[in-house]
């Protein structure tokens, strides 16, 4: 499975969205879980609701929230108030009794608020756009793993 | 009409390869696991594994791991199970079966193949 | 793997008695995907009750099936002639999917 990287910006949500074929998967709860190593035990974080019918229900654990549209076959997670040690590599999981099928890989890497930095230097912002509530969680980039960038300095 | 169609009786010797069908009609063939069971004479009912036409992932049951493969052609909606190389122990009937899905989940398995007979005698 | 111990092994009663069939599992069956399937000689199994307790299509309502985790019931409350049979359980929640060694429902 290639791993989707996803980054976010500290303090604020991020939304990782996990499509599967809905019938391959139908009647399965759906896990999100955070890898511990490399070759580690995946430990789960949130599960979706345990009445499978009831699954577009939100269902929370800390400020991990999740979602599955059965229908459009899409789990939604969304870490609120992102923090750097939320950072890591993370599972969508299809849950079949004991066994967990990996459905998708996520590097979660979280950006640091330029706002916050304390070496910005005289940032100017205008008094109207000073918040950053409601910010487009889309506007986080997502690539494959497996493609080359150039690095950053 | 849902329906699962399996080849008809085999008689086979000890060592001899086999491979068996299931043919699904009346529904979208790779929207759904396919499942094989086992039946030795006078027994009960053997689990042997599973497969998902759509892209052909397939789970076995410990005891046929590696006795058996499960296969599917999408073309022809044809599940199979076949096998390189025939035991005395592997005369049984052997029916597929389809996963049902229900509004509230997973619905069990409904219907099932009418049965194939192989018999494996030297 | 999951075991299904399903008892008695074999129940003799007569037409329009109630028959008690009970299946329990080594572990705990989640979201309850157990069901109830009848085999009569020289046929393939037939699915009676999936999800513990919702009767498939075309099922009599003397059928029923109740219980959760590990401890499932199937229940015919007036045996018909054409009800004896063999009755087995499969849990289709963890692979493999295992069944239970049956239950044969003879007339006594």
């Known amino acids: 499975l290639n791993t989707t990287v996803l980054q976010g910006m500290a303090g604020q949500s991020l939304r990782v969205s996990c499509t599967y074929d809905a019938l391959k998967h139908w009647g399965r709860r759906k896990a999100w879980c955070r890898q511990l190593g490399e070759e580690g035990p995946c430990q789960r974080v949130v599960s979706t609701h345990g009445v499978w019918l009831l699954a577009f229900l939100k269902k929370r654990n800390g400020s991990t929230v999740i979602a599955d549209d059965t229908l459009a076959g899409t789990v939604t997670i969304t870490l609120k108030n992102l923090q750097a040690g939320d950072a890591g590599l993370y599972q969508c999981q299809s849950l079949r009794g004991r066994e967990a099928e990996v459905l998708q890989k996520v590097l979660v890497e979280v950006l640091e608020d330029p706002l916050d930095d304390q070496d910005a230097g005289d940032l100017w912002v205008p008094e109207e756009s000073s918040s950053f509530e409601g910010a487009q969680v889309e506007h986080s980039t997502s690539r494959n793993q497996e493609t080359s960038f150039p690095p950053t300095s | 009409e849902v329906q699962l169609v399996q080849s008809g009786a085999e008689v086979k010797k000890p060592g001899e390869s086999l491979k068996i069908s299931c043919k699904g009609s009346g529904y979208t063939f790779t929207s759904y696991w396919i499942g094989w069971v086992r039946q030795m004479p006078g027994k009960g009912l053997e689990w042997m594994g599973i497969?998902?036409?759509?892209?052909?992932?397939?789970r076995y049951s410990p005891s046929f791991q590696g006795q058996v493969t499960i296969s599917v052609d999408k073309s022809s909606s044809t599940a199979y199970l076949q096998w390189s190389s025939l035991k005395a122990s592997d005369t049984a009937i052997y029916y597929c079966?389809?996963?049902?899905?229900?509004?509230?989940?997973?619905?069990?398995?409904?219907?099932w193949g009418q049965g194939t007979l192989v018999t494996v005698s030297s | 793997e999951i075991v299904l111990t399903q008892s008695p092994g074999t129940l003799s009663l007569s037409p329009g008695e109630r028959a008690t069939l009970s299946c329990r599992a080594s572990q705990s069956v989640s979201s309850s995907y157990l069901a109830w399937y009848q085999q009569k000689p020289g046929q393939a199994p037939r699915l009676l009750i999936y999800?513990?307790?919702s009767r498939a299509t075309g099922i009599p309502d003397r059928f029923s099936g109740s219980g959760s985790g590990t401890d499932f019931t199937l229940t015919i409350s007036r045996l018909e002639p054409e009800d004896f049979a063999l009755y087995y359980c499969?849990?289709?929640?963890?692979?493999?999917?295992?069944f239970g060694p049956g239950t044969k429902v003879d007339i006594k």
């Open positions: 999800g513990a307790s």
């Open positions: 079966t389809r996963q049902a899905i229900a509004v509230t989940g997973l619905g069990g398995f409904d219907p």
């Open positions: 499969q849990q289709y929640d963890t692979s493999p999917f295992t």
């Open positions: 497969i998902y036409p759509g892209d052909s992932d397939t």
